[in-house]
Interface confidence: low
């Protein structure tokens, strides 16, 4: 036998106590699939969260973060304070990257400068709190008589740690 509730479309719920009538979801609730016996409560974007997409009868609200904060977690479940480039967020707040590390984003953690010597290269441009070092040709490549200059390694994508 077919479940009569299966006829209830998204945006409604199946009323068990009213002979399986399909009733519209109440304000501030939604059902994203058919055949539901209750509607889900809409997410409320309050405080540091702001509404990116309003709740509808068939889909939940989506939140992002107010300026000065960024999303963390699936579906922006948390907002974390932004820091400046060259800083990272600690329990005590935003702290400058320690010597030998950098952060070129307004979130995330300080990462170690690339060790150019691992690739047999030398430091072409020194690193800062905000920028990684730039590796250049190896010292051998710069010696007189060298026939060619090895191009620097491709830049890493932001947010990726050195391998």
């Amino acid at each position: 036998l077919q479940d009569p509730c299966s006829n209830c479309p998204a945006g409604t719920f199946c009323d068990n106590n009213r002979n399986q009538i399909c009733s519209p979801c109440p304000p501030n609730s939604f059902s994203s699939a058919g055949g539901q016996r209750t509607c889900d409560i809409c997410r409320q974007c309050k405080g540091v969260f702001r509404t990116r997409k309003e709740c509808s009868s068939t889909s939940n609200a989506e939140c992002d973060c107010t300026p000065g904060f960024h999303c963390l977690g699936a579906g922006c479940s948390m907002c974390e304070q932004d820091c400046k480039q060259g800083q990272e967020l600690t329990k005590e707040g935003c702290k400058d990257c320690s010597f030998g590390t950098f952060n070129d984003e307004e979130h995330g953690v300080c990462r170690p400068w690339t060790d150019c010597s691992l690739d047999g290269k030398s430091v072409l441009v020194n690193g800062t709190k905000e920028r990684d070092v730039v590796c250049g040709p190896s010292p051998a490549d710069l010696s007189p008589g060298a026939s060619s200059v090895t191009p620097p390694a491709p830049a890493r994508e932001p947010g990726h740690s050195p391998q």
Partner: antibody
Framework: QSVEESGGRLVTPGTPLTLTCTVS????????MSWVRQAPGKGLEWIGI?????ITYYASWAKGRFTISKTSTMVDLKITSPTTEDTATYFC???????????????WGLGTLVTVSS | AIELTQTPSSVSAAVGGTVTINCQAS??????LAWYQQKPGQPPKLLIY???YLASGVPSRFKGSGSGTEYTLTISGVQSADAATYYC????????????FGGGTEVVVK
């Protein structure tokens, strides 16, 4: 249709504990579920809900102290760091709704007793 | 957060008498209220939903009424089996509800 809680026992303060609610005769994809607790000789206290789509809602006092999750036939309640104030019978209950939009508990388990003591 | 205040906390009634329990919400809950009966060692049992609708299998001597912020559960022709604690519960789509239940009313039948 039935709801049954398990996992309640004596634990020392700070020892995480997970309670399990096993349902039969209905689908967790159709019904939201809730956890409610009752300290000895006290009233009913709502902890939180897990919706059909897995969204969780907690009473403000319960946020960070409890975590609700589910599989296809079970709903778990994790007490993250129990204190003696968490000593209670924990009930799992099914939520239902109708066209006046009331959410009410139409099926309850018998409850499982958690005792937190050093 | 919506708060529910139940009065009285305890009431005594003779068999055949009438008991009235009140539930006041801190703000309007638009008839989104349920009543439960709980006996010692048992889980709560749904009696009334949507303020006035009788749940399946509940005797007609139980009656719910009210609207806005004021709600009442009336038990007419009280029987010894009605000795229990009764709780009101606010609607669940109000996600800010800190405690969905009133404090409870103990009914003692003489």
């Amino acid at each position: 249709q039935s709801v049954e809680e398990s996992g309640g026992r004596l634990v020392t303060p700070g020892t995480p504990l997970t309670l399990t609610c096993t349902v039969s005769g209905f689908s967790l994809s159709s019904y939201a579920m809730s956890w409610v607790r009752q300290a000895p000789g006290k009233g009913l206290e709502w902890i939180g809900i897990i919706s059909t789509s897995g969204i969780t809602y907690y009473a403000s006092w319960a946020k960070g102290r409890f975590t609700i999750s589910k599989t296809s036939t079970m709903v778990d309640l994790k007490i993250t760091s129990p204190t003696t104030e968490d000593t209670a019978t924990y009930f799992c209950a099914r939520l239902n709704g109708f066209d006046d939009y009331v959410r009410y508990f139409d099926f309850w388990g018998l409850g499982t007793l958690v005792t937190v003591s050093s | 957060a919506i708060e529910l205040t139940q009065t009285p906390s305890s009431v005594s009634a003779a068999v055949g008498g009438t008991v009235t329990i009140n539930c006041q919400a801190s703000e309007s809950i638009a008839s989104n209220l349920a009543w439960y009966q709980q006996k010692p060692g048992q889980p709560p049992k749904l009696l009334i939903y949507a303020a006035s609708y009788l749940a399946s299998g509940v005797p007609s001597r139980f009656k719910g009424s009210g609207s806005g912020t004021e709600y009442t559960l009336t038990i007419s022709g009280v029987q010894s089996a009605d000795a229990a604690t009764y709780y009101c519960q606010s609607a669940f789509y109000v996600s800010s509800s800190d405690n969905a239940f009133g404090g409870g009313t103990e009914v003692v039948v003489k």
